[in-house]
Interface confidence: low
Amino acid sequence: QPPPPPPDATCHQVRSFFQRLQPGLKWVPETPVPGSDLQVCLPKGPTCCSRKMEEKYQLTARLNMEQLLQSASMELKFLIIQNAAVFQEAFEIVVRHAKNYTNAMFKNNYPSLTPQAFEFVGEFFTDVSLYILGSDINVDDMVNELFDSLFPVIYTQLMNPGLPDSALDINECLRGARRDLKVFGNFPKLIMTQVSKSLQVTRIFLQALNLGIEVINTTDHLKFSKDCGRMLTRMWYCSYCQGLMMVKPCGGYCNVVMQGCMAGVVEIDKYWREYILSLEELVNGMYRIYDMENVLLGLFSTIHDSIQYVQKNAGKLTTTIGKLCAHSQQRQYRSAYYPEDLFIDKKVLKVAHVEHEETLSSRRRELIQKLKSFISFYSALPGYICSHSPVAENDTLCWNGQELVERYSQKAARNGMKNQFNLHELKMKGPEPVVSQIIDKLKHINQLLRTMSMPKGRVLDKNLDEEGFESGDCGDDEDECIGGSGDGMIKVKNQLRFLAELAYDLDVDDAPGNSQQATPKDNEISTFHNLGNVHSPLK
């Protein structure tokens, strides 16, 4: 044991130090005192600390701890906050482009529908955006509303244009006929399936990122218990009471204290690991019809095909609907007019060819890789904090909470603490209520993520057989059903450099005219320009 340093006969250094924490010297003894009222820095001899000083040290220690914790989580917090914002904005851009593609398709192929179609398309994609952000909207209802709204316009503008104004009150009948007669074939059901799958996954992805932020924010702003404050004070400040201003705590001692203080927080570790791994599974399954980018950007083509389907059956439909909706009171009898011989196009829809150069998919995978480097974040916190606060290297000539020691011994330190308070008790108290709440939220999101990802991402599948798909049709299990039929197959050149062009918007009025094909230009859409990445931190 090294000899103790000569005591500071005047408490001058302690006074000088303490004045920085608390202006005024009224609490600091001028010379060492017995310190019998001390509760944390229990003196082995005369001390330069008072009870009031102890209280100030405890406050300061807890503040330091809170700031260390915030510092520890800063990089992780920034990563998730930035990505949540970037993905949310990128998804909005996908929606905006999808809307513009669809509007361009109407403008180029069905200009007589455009004023109203633009309105319905706008409402549909607004609902898509709201759904992604968590709004309580039913995807099937969104799709039904789109086609319910479109059909009366198609009928009055394209199928029976000569209707007098007085016949416009047949809109309700036409909306009903749209469903009963399945005038768009199975395309609405196909869109429902694709859109609901891709949007549900997108929505849960954003929810998971936002919960990640909440987890970090919760642990970032934890208020540490008084017991923890006492342990921290003993570790960081009690040495000053003995005039040992330059002595640093032993590293091993710091680890013991941090494990005590952080016991509740470290309980998050198991659920945090599961969160990152579940998020990775979800991301791995986000392709084809589980990728909203892929689905929404091909939607204009499927809608075009659905209108072509109406077109092919227009003759029979006009006759049937003419009878059905001639007087709106006949509406209740409409099922009697169900046409048995509508033309059913059983040609297999071709896949919209997607060239992935740099898509949201690669961004998602990049985020997961970065998040995985933080998989041990919570279990590593005590060690991180010790390595980022003043500790003695190699545990030599360091402070063990009671005295300056040549070498730290965990056993001796624990024994020395027994009469002051029990570390074990501190650990056994269980996590703070806020930590328990965040663990419950993590459990819930992990359950949701697992549900979405397993088995093989097919949990969301619905059986569409009863809807009339036959072999050769585009059934639900065929992930490829994204758009383009016959010779009008769409080639989507998907160079999504979203982060480079967050302000970019396709103006429908600029779309080149082409009344024959589904696509605005030469059977190919490539409105995404490589403008270079603006948001380089994600690279």
């Epitope: 000088s16 700031q67 003043p390």
Partner: nanobody
């Protein structure tokens, strides 16, 4: 190992201004508190100002409050001390220091890395 390099010192007339800079390298600058200290000839080194890791909190010695402003640019790994209304008693060697504490403490024992110092001379 952390390196701190001060610059911006010099000779200035009373009432004038100077801006000191301290460029840091060697560890994640944005995680750590930073401070400025000064030492006049024949006197002990004293605290001048400190700033927390995020820049959200600043602290000043009473003698410089209202005249000096500490700031940081985490993107540039640099901390600054803007000194206005300088007085002859501000003459000293000014040291930049980096602390393991994110808060930017006020006492030099809580700083573990120091720059070489830059001379500030205020003439009357």
């Amino acid at each position: 190992q952390v390196q701190l390099q001060e610059s911006g010192g010099g000779l200035v007339q009373a009432g004038g201004s100077l801006r000191l800079s301290c460029a840091a390298s060697g560890r994640t600058f944005s995680s750590y508190g930073m401070g400025w200290f000064r030492q006049a000839p024949g006197k002990e080194r004293e605290f001048v100002a400190a700033i927390s890791w995020s820049g959200g909190s600043t602290y000043y010695a009473d003698s410089v409050k209202g005249r000096f402003t500490i700031s940081r640019d985490n993107a540039k790994n640099t901390v600054y001390l803007q000194m206005n209304s300088l007085k002859p008693e501000d003459t000293a060697v000014y040291y930049c220091a980096s602390s393991a504490w994110p808060a930017g403490p006020k006492h030099q024992v809580e700083y573990d890395y120091w720059g070489q110092g830059t001379q500030v001379t205020v003439s009357s």
